[in-house]
């Protein structure tokens, strides 16, 4: 399976919502034995590989944002702790899952990984990411709405795993 | 915070079975692997096998013949069972926590089980 | 299975040096490598994950790096608590594996 970024790059301005996507692409094995863990952090494109490096999200952990369920079953972080950090990760039954972030500010401006392991039990873990840029914008140049530029089909292919 | 803690007869007779299990407290028992990790004494550490919350269980295959750890969810708990121990199985045994595509992020403090007749 | 294997075996330092310590494994293991401390009567300690990312409240002084099959932890100036046993263990498949230990002692 391979993780689409439907958009490699949001452009918003302070104070608006945003919801960064991700796409589980290919088959997905539904058996007992295999799950899915999916989880967001904010990285750099340094370091050994693009997303590599994991870094909170407004001081919460991959963990804290992780979303847990089996194929393409739906699930969002019920955590209040990620609420009150005006923050939600979520999935749907079509192998989308997103992150909002909510009242966004300049410190929010960065690289964004969205991270699937597919857990095969007696095998191993297989990774697979995607990253997105967010760039938050003040003053007469932001625009009013969050914009989105659309992924080449080659990066919105990206794969890295093991 | 979460917390594990390990308890369990600190000795076995040798064939015998040895019974552990370790309880969550502060925190899901939910999307993680509970782990169990043994180190004789002076050596290092050994990966003896982890369940899913789901129930899926994965083991050492140097062990896998005697082992089996099983999960009760409404109690927080999960458990080991290593049966025909010898001398050889005298370790202290640990209980952690790992994260799927990380490491063992939380540990229990580890119980000295002695395999003697 | 993948073999981890750490050097030095025992690292004799003085408190304010700097600590390099080595893990090779049998084969690849990408950068899925984790480093643990322990201390004696204690449980090992997370201290690295995926080669190079500190663990949940882990000093800056402690650093990871390397992919493949060569890793290094390096403690840039040692601190009298860091005098300890420093295991790795990778990830990339399934039976997990620990090195054996580098034990960091007082010169």
């Known amino acids: 399976f391979k993780v689409a970024t439907p958009y490699s790059l949001y452009v918003c301005p302070e104070g608006q919502n945003v919801t960064l996507t991700c796409r589980l692409l290919g088959p997905v094995d539904k058996g007992h034995d295999v799950t899915f863990y999916k989880t967001w952090y904010r990285s750099s494109r340094g370091e050994v590989q693009t997303c590599s490096e994991r870094r909170p999200i407004r001081n919460l952990t991959f963990q804290d944002l992780h979303l847990h369920h089996g194929g393409h079953q739906a699930a969002n972080t019920s955590h209040d702790l990620a609420q009150r950090h005006g923050l939600e990760s979520a999935s749907d039954h079509h192998g989308n899952f997103s992150i909002t972030m909510r009242n966004l500010t300049l410190l929010d401006s960065g690289l964004y990984c969205c991270l699937v392991v597919e857990i095969r039990h007696h095998h191993s873990e297989h990774r697979v990411h995607g990253a997105m840029e967010l760039q938050v914008q003040t003053g007469k140049d932001a625009p009013s709405n969050c914009v989105v530029y659309p992924s080449s089909s080659q990066d919105s292919e990206n794969i890295t795993a093991a | 915070q979460v917390q594990l803690q390990e308890s369990g007869p600190g000795l076995v007779k040798p064939s015998e079975t040895l019974s552990l299990t370790c309880t969550v407290s502060g925190g899901s028992i939910s999307s993680y692997y509970w782990s169990w990790i043994r180190q004789p004494p002076g050596k290092g550490l050994e990966w003896i096998g982890y369940?899913?919350?789901?129930?899926?269980?994965n083991y050492n295959p140097s062990l896998k013949s005697r082992v089996t750890i099983s999960v009760d969810t409404s109690k927080s708990q999960f458990s080991l069972k290593l049966s025909s121990v010898t001398a050889a199985d005298t370790a202290v045994y640990y209980c952690?926590?790992?994260?799927?595509?990380?490491?063992?992020?939380?540990w229990g403090q580890g119980t000295m089980v002695i395999v003697s007749s | 299975e993948i073999v981890l294997t750490q050097s030095p075996a025992t690292l004799s330092l003085s408190p304010g040096e700097r600590a390099t310590l080595s893990c090779r494994a049998s084969q690849s293991v990408s950068y899925y490598l984790a480093w643990y401390q322990q201390k004696p009567g204690q449980a090992p300690r997370l201290l690295i994950y995926?080669?190079?990312n500190r663990a949940t409240g882990i000093p800056a002084r402690f650093s990871g790096s390397g992919s493949g099959t060569d890793f290094t932890l390096t403690i840039s100036s040692l601190e009298p608590e860091d005098f300890a046993v420093y295991y790795c263990q990778q990830r990339i498949n399934w039976p997990l594996t620990f090195g054996g230990g580098t034990k960091v002692e007082i010169k």
């Open positions: 952690a926590r790992d994260i799927p595509a990380s490491a063992f992020d939380i």
């Open positions: 995926d080669a190079f």
């Open positions: 369940i899913y919350y789901s129930g899926s269980t």
